[in-house]
């Protein structure tokens, strides 16, 4: 018996096409994604095989003007159309709490919404209580298939789930669903989540009866033979992992952005075993047509976006400076501003030792793009922010060694005067340069804001220590030169758009008035 | 033109079980979702579930969950609908309908299946 | 459930007159998803309205539809006898779909 696995994961609000790099598309002739795109993909495949999966892996949220605009709702209207089949829990289906979950998607889906690992306690629990479920069986043709879902149990430290939901290790918390689906005479069963690739792995090696892991949360691109764009494969696809009991079974995951539509055909025996697998994600380029009712559709729920942009978020009061002879030369208010929006977006899990997880941001001075000037009534609009960040990249969580830190900081000014784009502006470090040393050896003073205190105050930074930093994912990935972050980071999970970021804390604060204080010397 | 033709008919003993069809033409049977409606004589509408025809996948009202039972054979683009245990209150027509996959409104309705539960 | 509420459940009136029948969602509902159906006695239901203020291809242009939230109506500029029928509001927004009770309009 054969079955087709169709899986996307990580669309992040991609529901019009993209550039190449999943940025706003600007030549539609080269664009790509997008869920009209997807939709003809789709039913194409259902239309030539019979026994046809569609599922998405989490994070659907988060990642343009659509998500900040309608919250939720867009996701399930268009996965409703797309008759996806199940979907697991993301990180950021959390980002405006549970009631910005249940609300405009788990209301409203029209398909199992699933995680193994999460349990609801508390007035939450009945509040919640059927609206997403550990496992789903579904008929597919003649047959059943048990769908069991999984979520990051970093989740708490990357979104905002707040207090009664309990996020458990993955693996423990499948195990016993698994079971219960073999008790129910389910011999086919997919694990669908969002923890990333390595824990994926894991699940595979580990989780007794699992036939297939379909992932998320890494962008993880996996492809066999010669890959059609350019991301560069971290593995083959589907990427097979020997679990403990001896079993080959397929772990696949389809990058992010809706760039690609994953394409998995498993062949079971007659006992569930998976005999033979094989497929490769669809590259969704051009050469695909937009179905004309979905395209049309978004035409549709696009007016409301337009709209969006050009109404106020909030005022300034002064010169916001992005201006690159500032950002890319020295302290700039643009840069603190962004850095302060950055920490304060990730206020989250404070307890008896610690005020915040995390406390300090690095942002590359070329990232700024444009100054906001106060002379306008100080307003400032999404438009107005668009500007300033143009590259709809996200604001990351990264784990790094104080020497590792050291060494960026010395790469911010290994070249200064030239105008370049690596020259850090910062939030919660102090740092002092001395440009008359040599490239390599300038940084004299290192201070970071404490987390671990009641009273934040600045510390001198660790080498051997290992901290948490918000960046630019433009960074994360080593970009500007930035190669010992990308090399040497010990945990990399996504964030939130950056414009989403900064114009979350500047509607909150309603007036704003960043200075230069001294962060940069 | 779309059309959806539905058998005759029929007449059963409470506890007993009726199959009805539902023939779909005029359009790619797979692209849409087909939902099946009860209306008792002079009453309203009542949703019983919808089955993909691509994948056979099904969603049921919980009223009828366990009771009826949707499948379709995609080479005959025929829909099924079984309802199982009857009783009197089953006696109704029962409707096969296609929706819509945006606004998921039934656009395409079949002519009906009279069903008769009498001891 | 989300419970749909007709008024009136039924309606005499007159050729020409002005008719309108609400429905009441017992929460709310995206207008994108509520819909409007006309039924004739021994025949199955049309589609009339859709996505609360879209007609149907060949509904005349008499009929209209408005609403947000939980307060729908489907109105009738001036009754035609070939608009004497029953008609159902219906909601796919949240699970279960569920329809309105129906409201019959008589000639009066």
């Known amino acids: 018996w054969e079955l087709t696995i169709l899986h996307t994961n990580d669309v992040h609000s991609r529901l019009e096409q993209t550039s190449e790099d999943s940025s706003k598309c600007v030549n539609a002739s080269r664009c790509m994604g997008g869920v009209a795109r997807l939709f003809t993909k789709v039913q194409q495949i259902r239309r030539a095989e019979p026994n046809v999966l569609l599922l998405d892996a989490g994070d659907q949220y988060q990642g343009t003007i659509w998500f900040t605009v309608y919250k939720g709702a867009e996701v399930a209207h268009f996965m409703n159309a797309l008759r996806y089949d199940a979907m697991a829990l993301g990180n950021h289906e959390f980002d405006n709490g549970v009631e910005g979950l249940i609300e405009p998607l788990l209301k409203e889906a029209k398909f199992p919404i699933l995680s193994a690992n999460i349990k609801a306690k508390g007035p939450l629990a009945s509040q919640i209580s059927g609206l997403y479920l550990p496992y789903k069986v579904l008929p597919v043709g003649d047959e059943v298939v048990g769908i069991v879902g999984y979520t990051s149990k970093e989740t708490p430290f990357l979104s905002n789930p707040g207090t009664n939901l309990v996020f458990e290790d993955e693996i423990t918390a499948l195990q016993p669903e698994v079971d219960k689906l073999k008790t129910l005479n389910v011999n086919k069963i997919i694990a669908l989540g969002h923890s990333g690739f390595e824990t994926d792995k894991l699940i595979a090696q580990k989780v007794r009866g699992v036939d297939v892991v379909v992932g998320g949360h890494s962008n993880t691109f996996l492809y066999t033979g010669n890959p059609p764009s350019k991301e560069v494969p971290a593995g083959k696809y589907p990427f097979i992992v020997t679990s403990d009991d001896g079993r080959k079974v397929p772990v696949v995951q389809a990058y992010a952005f809706g760039k690609y539509l994953g394409y998995l055909k498993i062949e079971f025996d007659e006992r569930g075993n998976v005999i033979s697998s094989h497929g490769n994600p669809i590259l969704l380029n051009s050469s695909i047509p937009e179905d004309p009712s979905i395209k049309a559709d978004i035409n549709k729920w696009r007016i409301k976006l337009d709209n969006y942009s050009t109404q106020e978020l909030g005022k300034t009061i002064v010169y916001l400076d992005g201006s690159s002879q500032s950002c890319r030369f020295r302290e700039c208010n643009m840069g603190n501003l962004i850095c302060d929006a950055m920490i304060n977006n990730n206020l989250r899990h404070a307890d008896e030792m610690f005020w915040n997880h995390v406390s300090m941001c690095i942002l590359n001075g070329g990232g700024i793009r444009s100054p906001i000037d106060e002379r306008n009534n100080g307003t400032i609009t999404w438009e107005n922010l668009a500007a300033v960040l143009p590259f709809g990249g996200t604001f990351d969580l990264v784990q790094l060694k104080g020497s590792t830190l050291k060494k960026a900081f010395e790469h911010s000014v290994h070249r200064y005067g030239q105008s370049t784009g690596e020259f850090l502006q910062v939030g919660g470090i102090h740092v002092v340069y001395d440009l008359s040393r040599k490239p390599g050896d300038r940084v004299v003073k290192l201070d970071v804001l404490c987390t671990k205190c009641r009273v934040p105050s600045y510390d001198p930074l660790k080498m051997d220590e290992i901290y948490k930093v918000i960046l630019p994912n433009f960074l994360a990935n080593g970009g500007d030169g930035f190669q010992m972050i990308k090399d040497e980071l010990l945990r990399h999970d996504s964030g939130d758009q950056d414009i989403n970021v900064v114009s979350t804390y500047i509607s909150k604060m309603k007036v704003i008035y960043p200075a230069v204080e001294g962060r940069i010397k | 033109q779309v059309q959806l033709v539905q058998s005759g008919a029929e007449v059963k003993k409470p506890g007993a079980s009726v199959k009805m069809s539902c023939k779909a033409s005029?359009?790619?049977?797979?692209?849409?979702?087909m939902h099946w409606v009860k209306q008792s004589h002079g009453k309203s509408l009542e949703w019983i579930g919808y089955?993909?025809?691509?994948?056979?996948?099904?969603t049921y009202n919980p009223k009828f969950e366990g009771r009826a039972t949707l499948t379709v054979d995609t080479s005959a683009s025929t829909a099924y609908m079984e309802l199982r245990s009857l009783r009197s209150e089953d006696t109704a027509v029962y409707y096969c309908?296609?929706?819509?996959?945006?606004?998921?409104?039934?656009?395409?309705w079949g002519q009906g299946t009279t069903v008769t539960v009498s001891s | 459930d989300i419970v749909m509420t007709q008024s009136p459940s039924s309606l005499s009136a007159s050729v020409g007159d002005r008719v309108t029948i609400t429905c009441t969602a017992s929460s709310s509902v995206s207008s994108s998803y509520l819909h409007w159906y006309q039924q004739k006695p021994g025949s199955s239901p049309k589609l009339w309205i859709y996505?609360?203020?879209n007609l149907a291809s060949g509904v005349p242009g008499r009929f209209s539809g408005s609403g947000s939230g939980t307060d729908y109506t489907l109105t009738i500029s001036s009754l035609q006898p070939e608009d004497f029928a029953t008609y159902y509001c219906?909601?796919?927004?949240?699970?279960?779909?569920?329809f309105g009770a129906g409201t019959k309009l008589e000639i009066k």
């Open positions: 309908v296609r929706s819509d996959f945006l606004y998921w409104y039934f656009d395409v």
């Open positions: 089955i993909k025809p691509h994948n056979a996948g099904t």
């Open positions: 996505s609360t203020s």
């Open positions: 219906h909601q796919y927004h949240r699970s279960p779909l569920t």
């Open positions: 005029g359009y790619t049977f797979t692209d849409y979702n």
